[in-house]
């Protein structure tokens, strides 16, 4: 999906209002220095691409993020503020339903969510070039 035409400010508002709090809840009890942020993004569409990938794509050691509250709210925000996003996700959602797994918070998941927080931070405050 090409995130270029999303309403970035509306997605930012959704993140600051609710999604960020759910990420904090997920990470509760984890020190901010515990994980090193290695994933970066260059601009807002790229950040959303990386955020979508880390949130919804199962990875080795962390298969369960897509069913977390922050993930559901992320999906809702993208569906509302990114034209045509919902349609691209129908097949992915059906595939996900077939491989429902028990929710387990692993250290790998915590590390992944820490990376997500960095991506969201970057998405919210890209440095603007002064003309």
């Amino acid at each position: 999906y090409d995130f270029t035409n999303c309403d970035f400010e509306k997605i930012k508002a959704a993140y600051l209002s609710t999604i960020s709090k759910d990420l904090i809840t997920y990470m509760s009890g984890t020190k901010s220095t515990e994980f090193n942020n290695t994933v970066s993004c260059s601009n807002r569409p790229h950040c959303l691409t990386e955020i979508q990938s880390l949130t919804f794509n199962p990875t080795a050691g962390c298969a369960s993020l897509a069913k977390e509250m922050f993930a559901m709210k992320t999906k809702a925000a993208l569906a509302i503020w990114c034209p045509g996003y919902s349609e691209t996700q129908i097949n992915a959602t059906q595939a996900m339903k077939k491989r429902r797994k028990r929710k387990v918070t692993t250290n790998k998941c915590l590390e992944q969510v820490s990376q997500l927080q960095g991506l969201w931070r970057r998405f919210n405050r890209p440095l603007l070039k002064q003309q």
């Epitope: 600051l16 901010s32 220095t33 942020n37 260059s42 927080q117 960095g118 998405f123 919210n124 002064q130």
Partner: antibody, heavy 120, light 111 residues
Framework: EVQLVQSGAEVKKPGSSVKVSCKAS????????MHWVRQAPGQGLEWMGA????????SYNQKFKDRVTITADKSTSTAYMELSSLRSEDTAVYYC?????????????WGQGTTVTVSS | DIVLTQSPDSLAVSLGERATINCRAS??????????MHWYQQKPGQPPKLLIY???NLGSGVPDRFSGSGSGTDFTLTISSLQAEDVAVYYC?????????FGQGTKLEIK
């Protein structure tokens, strides 16, 4: 807890340059915007510019664009601000500041400040 | 650039009384229903300290006698009951539009 420690006070001649450092410890460095703000004696706060250490992207206040260069070294978690062609009006305390965790755009961690005096 | 104008420039209030500082922006700092205006307190020889973020949210460890309100172009910082340690200069800051700008500051003293 995140801390920003800045280099010591500097006395410079007009026309010269100064480079101030700001070392971050106790937290992730590369994914936070790092800013530089200055304060002339008895005056208010003035934003100079910022850097995203993750890729070195910068943004500058037009007022300083031709004279200021902000850089970052991820390996040492250090940000730098270099100001050239110094004049007496550049006498000020220079602060580095880190943006918040969420991208709200406020500064939750500040360096202790570096006093730069420009005098002939 | 967005210009932030604080009023008054200085303010003297009795201990235990209410102190109110205003900040007016030359254009709206709102975006998608959120107000990107922040408030700082600065004491002599120290860096600024965050008090209020996004117009009305209390910063970490800030006493609840501090509060913020407003939206669009008009914002207010209120100290409900002035304490001796509140003597400082207070700044508003907007982040909605680059370049980031600060108000000129309001000096708060005890009457």
């Amino acid at each position: 807890e995140v801390q920003l420690v800045q280099s010591g006070a500097e006395v410079k001649k007009p026309g010269s340059s100064v480079k101030v450092s700001c070392k971050a410890s106790g937290g992730t460095f590369s994914t936070y915007n790092m800013h530089w703000v200055r304060q002339a004696p008895g005056q208010g706060l003035e934003w100079m510019g910022a850097i995203y250490p993750g890729n070195g992207e910068t943004s500058y206040n037009q007022k300083f664009k031709d004279r200021v260069t902000i850089t970052a070294d991820k390996s040492t978690s250090t940000a730098y601000m270099e100001l050239s062609s110094l004049r007496s009006e550049d006498t000020a305390v220079y602060y580095c500041a880190r943006e918040d965790d969420y991208g709200e755009g406020y500064f939750d961690v500040w360096g202790q400040g570096t006093t730069v005096t420009v005098s002939s | 650039d967005i210009v932030l104008t604080q009023s008054p420039d200085s303010l003297a209030v009795s201990l235990g009384e209410r102190a109110t500082i205003n900040c007016r922006a030359s254009e709206s700092v709102d975006n998608s229903g959120l107000s990107f205006m922040h408030w700082y307190q600065q004491k002599p020889g120290q860096p600024p300290k965050l008090l209020i973020y996004r117009a009305s949210n209390l910063g970490s460890g800030v006493p609840d006698r501090f509060s913020g309100s407003g939206s669009g172009t008009d914002f207010t910082l209120t100290i409900s009951s002035l304490q001796a340690e509140d003597v400082a200069v207070y700044y508003c800051q907007q982040i909605n539009t680059d370049p980031l700008t600060f108000g000129q500051g309001t000096k708060l003293e005890i009457k």
